[in-house]
């Protein structure tokens, strides 16, 4: 006999919520795998700038995305399938995973705050590498997509450390409409915007983290309520 009334509502709410979560994880994983295995991006590993081999920040970022996507899919599946199957075991595992993820988020938040300058530096390096790849290999649509995301999200274009060729390519192709890389080269510097994000606008990242944490707590409560509901319904 299945759960009834309010518990049934929680069951479907948890199902829908986690199905969306699972889908989002699938999208992130798919994009990350595309970025990682597309032959155009793979060339970045072998790219040399002058006499120096290119650093690997681009790939570290992609591996983080792959991990996030995989975890989201796994946790989403547990919540989704556990709710629809009314499985106490799966919901218990789901709850445990959420507790672990919550702890990880808190730890990551503390670590991120302490190391925000290094993270900002890595994000800038990630941007530079994506930009470099988009220019050097003009077929690298994935790198272009990363650059476009940076430019549109941060409303910036290029940086004050651009090479001549990158300046020329950006000027003609990759700056958001309305921005002028030549006259606003320093005003719209993406490096500066990244620094601003990790200093002046750190509260935005904080708000995002709190929202995620609240969702996690909300899901933990729902899964526990559903679990108890299943246990109670199986008694009668």
């Amino acid at each position: 006999m299945g759960v009834e009334g309010c518990t049934k509502c929680i069951k479907y709410l948890l199902f829908v919520f986690n199905f969306v979560f699972w889908l989002a994880g699938g999208v992130i994983l798919g994009v990350a795998l595309w970025l990682r295995h597309d032959p155009q991006t793979t060339n970045l590993l072998y790219l040399e700038l002058g006499d120096k081999p290119a650093p690997n920040t681009f790939y570290v970022g992609i591996y983080i995305l792959i991990a996030v996507g995989a975890v989201m899919m796994f946790v989403g599946f547990l919540g989704c399938y556990g709710a629809i199957q009314e499985s106490q075991c799966l919901l218990g595992t789901f709850f445990t995973c959420l507790v672990i993820l919550f702890a990880c988020e808190v730890a990551a938040g503390i670590w991120g705050f302490v190391n925000k300058d290094q993270i900002a530096k890595d994000v800038k390096q990630f941007y530079d590498q994506a930009l470099q790849q988009a220019v050097v290999d003009d077929d690298a649509n994935n790198a272009k997509a990363v650059v476009k995301t940076f430019h549109e999200t941060l409303d910036c274009c290029g940086s004050s450390t651009l090479t001549a060729l990158t300046t020329s390519v950006l000027k003609n192709n990759a700056c958001p409409s309305g921005s002028n890389i030549i006259s606003n080269l320093f005003k719209e510097d993406c490096h500066q915007k990244i620094d601003d994000l990790f200093s002046g606008k750190l509260y935005l990242i904080g708000i995002a983290a709190i929202v995620v944490a609240v969702i996690m707590i909300f899901e933990m409560i729902l899964s526990m309520v559903l679990c108890c509901g299943i246990r109670n319904s199986s008694v009668y």
Epitope: E48, L49, G50, D51, Q132, V135, V136, D137, D138, D139, S160, T161, T163, A164, L165, T167, S168, V169, K171, N172, N173, I182, L185
Partner: antibody
Framework: EVQLLESGGGLVQPGGSLRLSCAAS????????MSWVRQAPGKGLEWVSY????????DYADSVKGRFTISRDNSKNTLYLQMNSLRAEDTAVYYC????????????WGQGTLVTVSS | QSVLTQPASASGTPGQRVTISCTGS?????????THWYQRLPGTAPKLLIY???NRPSGVPDRFSGSKSGTSASLAISGLRSEDEADYYC???????????FGGGTKLTVLG
């Protein structure tokens, strides 16, 4: 050894057209940006145009915009410059050059081909 | 009239040190884009001599050196040799013109 060999230059009347070619060898042509640079008699060098490895990005000097078209055929390892509506001031030696992203400059040049625009 | 200004000519005797200047503006050399130097020996293709203000490609003797200060750059040739007789060009990128710019070239003569 990197080699760039230009051809197609010659005498042409004002308003006429000419197509320059540059045969490349000794490096992976399809992975490199290529460029044209010219030098008018008694003048300094002047950048004309560039093209990216897969022809996605191109740019031109203001003096030739709308008249010149740069293109490439990676299967033939050849760079082209289609010059239309030629003027007397386009008279120059045209050099084909490889653009190095790492060094951010023209690292290898051809010997050049002379284009004379005169009636 | 070239965007980057170079002396039309320079000369020196074998063994001497010669410096060729290249003056630009805040939109090219002063904007932080590297200054590069090319050598064109009579009847040959231009050859990259110095890149990124002061770096030498492999095969270029260490007698050649480059430097940059503000909106100007210079090429120094020490221990001058007769085979150094050539035209020398400086090059940078100009943000106002949105293109690559060159100096008018300096004809170096090795005397005696």
């Amino acid at each position: 050894e990197v080699q760039l060999l230009e051809s197609g230059g010659g005498l042409v009347q004002p308003g006429g057209s000419l197509r320059l070619s540059c045969a490349a060898s000794g490096f992976t042509f399809s992975s490199n940006y290529m460029s044209w640079v010219r030098q008018a008699p008694g003048k300094g060098l002047e950048w004309v145009s560039y093209i990216s490895s897969s022809s996605t990005y191109t740019d031109y000097a203001d003096s030739v915009k709308g008249r010149f078209t740069i293109s490439r055929d990676n299967s033939k390892n050849t760079l082209y410059l289609q010059m239309n509506s030629l003027r007397a001031e386009d008279t120059a030696v045209y050099y084909c050059a490889r653009y190095s992203y790492g060094r951010d400059n023209f690292d290898y040049w051809g010997q050049g081909t002379l284009v004379t625009v005169s009636s | 009239q070239s965007v980057l200004t170079q002396p039309a000519s320079a000369s020196g005797t074998p063994g001497q040190r010669v410096t060729i200047s290249c003056t630009g503006s805040t939109s090219n050399i002063g904007a932080g884009y590297g200054t590069h130097w090319y050598q064109r020996l009579p009847g040959t293709a231009p050859k990259l001599l110095i890149y990124g203000n002061s770096n030498r490609p492999s095969g270029v003797p260490d007698r050649f050196s480059g430097s940059k200060s503000g909106t100007s750059a210079s090429l120094a040739i020490s221990g001058l040799r007769s085979e150094d007789e050539a035209d020398y060009y400086c090059q940078s990128y100009d943000t106002n013109l949105s293109g690559w710019v060159f100096g008018g070239g300096t004809k170096l003569t090795v005397l005696g």
